[in-house]
């Protein structure tokens, strides 16, 4: 069975820069990847960046950066120009489409002890969505 | 149109460092990693590592740790990957290649000729 | 690191002909594999993604497939301009590493 996982981390130099890495783990072809903050994509959650394999990649604030980082996980920066933070609270969420498989996402956030630099283990987390 | 440009051939002593340049033209090293990659005569691919030109950030082949050293100046557009401690094992075509608006090397450099010998 | 084991070394065949390639990796990639092509004298090209995507403006003569550690790479029907050594990489997890390489040459 196909599986996402997500792993957010707060850059240890800069305080109020973030980083969400997702990956998927199965046999398809990755056709798109969606992140959104503040629940699922099309369930409440807002989009912060698409990339698509072939047309490349798109992001919007406060995404700064969304890049592949192999074919199978991807990683998004993330700056926060307000004084307080609010990602530290955010639910980050990850969906693949995947051909044959279909789509899968997972969501993670910030762990609450995280120390700048650290990073939630990169294990699979449950998959809540798979269309 | 994309392109990678290369700094051209090295001749240099055993011991010595070299930097090599890659200097990125149609699209914005900080949109990418770019990474490095090594090849000797009749001999496969071997990768170097790669740096996030964004904040400097470097990964390396375990093999290639303290041998190499990559860095990026995004007001240029430029990567760099500085050898040191040249041995004539050093000697072989090394090419930059981006990686990260698609999940593949989609543009190489032409490659740099590094020759080490007394 | 994955090792990545590419067989055969040489190829020599005649225009027309099939030729297969494959790459064994040491362990599981799932499809995290890509061919390349390269031509004496110039930087490698890619051929195929995922294992089986075929890139923009590449022949159909060039096909891969494969998942888990066993993929293979075939040229349906061998071209005069074919002639260059192909590689297979994966970049599943890091460091990126490539088979050794097949050099084909034409009869």
């Known amino acids: 069975t196909p599986e996402v996982w997500v792993q957010v981390q707060m850059e240890a130099t800069e305080l109020s820069s973030f980083t969400v890495h997702c990956g998927f783990l199965g046999p398809g072809s990755i056709s798109l990847v969606t992140v959104s903050w503040g629940g699922p994509d099309g369930a409440g959650g807002t989009k912060l960046a698409v990339l698509h394999p072939e047309l490349g990649t798109r992001q919007w604030a406060p995404a700064r950066q969304a890049r592949w980082e192999t074919q199978s996980s991807i990683s998004l920066a993330l700056e926060d120009s307000g004084a307080s933070s609010p990602f530290a609270n955010t639910t980050f969420c990850c969906k693949f489409a995947s051909f044959p498989e279909g789509s899968w996402e997972s969501c993670g956030s910030l762990p609450p002890s995280s120390d700048p630099g650290l990073s939630a283990p990169p294990t699979p987390v449950p998959i809540l969505r798979a269309d | 149109e994309v392109q990678l440009q290369q700094s051209g051939a090295e001749l240099v002593k055993p011991g010595a460092s070299v930097k090599l340049s890659c200097t990125a033209s149609g699209f914005n090293i900080k949109d990418i990693y770019m990474h490095w990659l090594k090849q000797r005569p009749e001999q496969g691919l071997e990768w170097i590592g790669r740096?996030?030109?964004?904040?400097?950030?470097?990964e390396y082949d375990p093999r290639f740790q303290g041998k190499a050293t990559l860095t990026a100046d995004t007001s240029s557009n430029i990567a760099y990957l500085q050898l040191s401690s040249l041995t004539s094992e050093d000697t072989a075509v090394y090419y930059c290649?981006?990686?990260?608006?698609?999940?593949?090397?989609?543009?190489w450099g032409q490659g740099t000729t590094l020759t080490v010998s007394s | 690191s994955i090792v990545m084991t590419q067989t055969p070394k040489f190829l020599l065949v005649s225009a027309g002909d099939r030729v297969t390639i494959t790459c064994k990796a040491s362990q599981s990639v799932n499809k995290a594999v890509v061919w390349y092509q390269q031509k004496p004298g110039q930087s490698p090209k890619l051929l195929i993604n995922?294992?089986?995507n075929r890139y923009t403006g590449v022949p159909d003569r060039f096909t891969g497939s494969g998942y888990g550690t066993d993929f293979t790479f075939s040229i349906s029907t061998v071209q005069a301009e074919d002639l260059a050594v192909y590689f297979c990489?994966?970049?599943?997890?890091?460091?990126?590493?490539f088979g050794g390489g097949t050099k084909l040459e034409i009869k």
């Open positions: 740096v996030d030109p964004t904040n400097g950030n470097s």
């Open positions: 990489q994966q970049d599943y997890s890091s460091p990126w590493t």
């Open positions: 995922y294992a089986s």
């Open positions: 290649a981006r990686f990260g608006i698609y999940p593949y090397f989609d543009y």
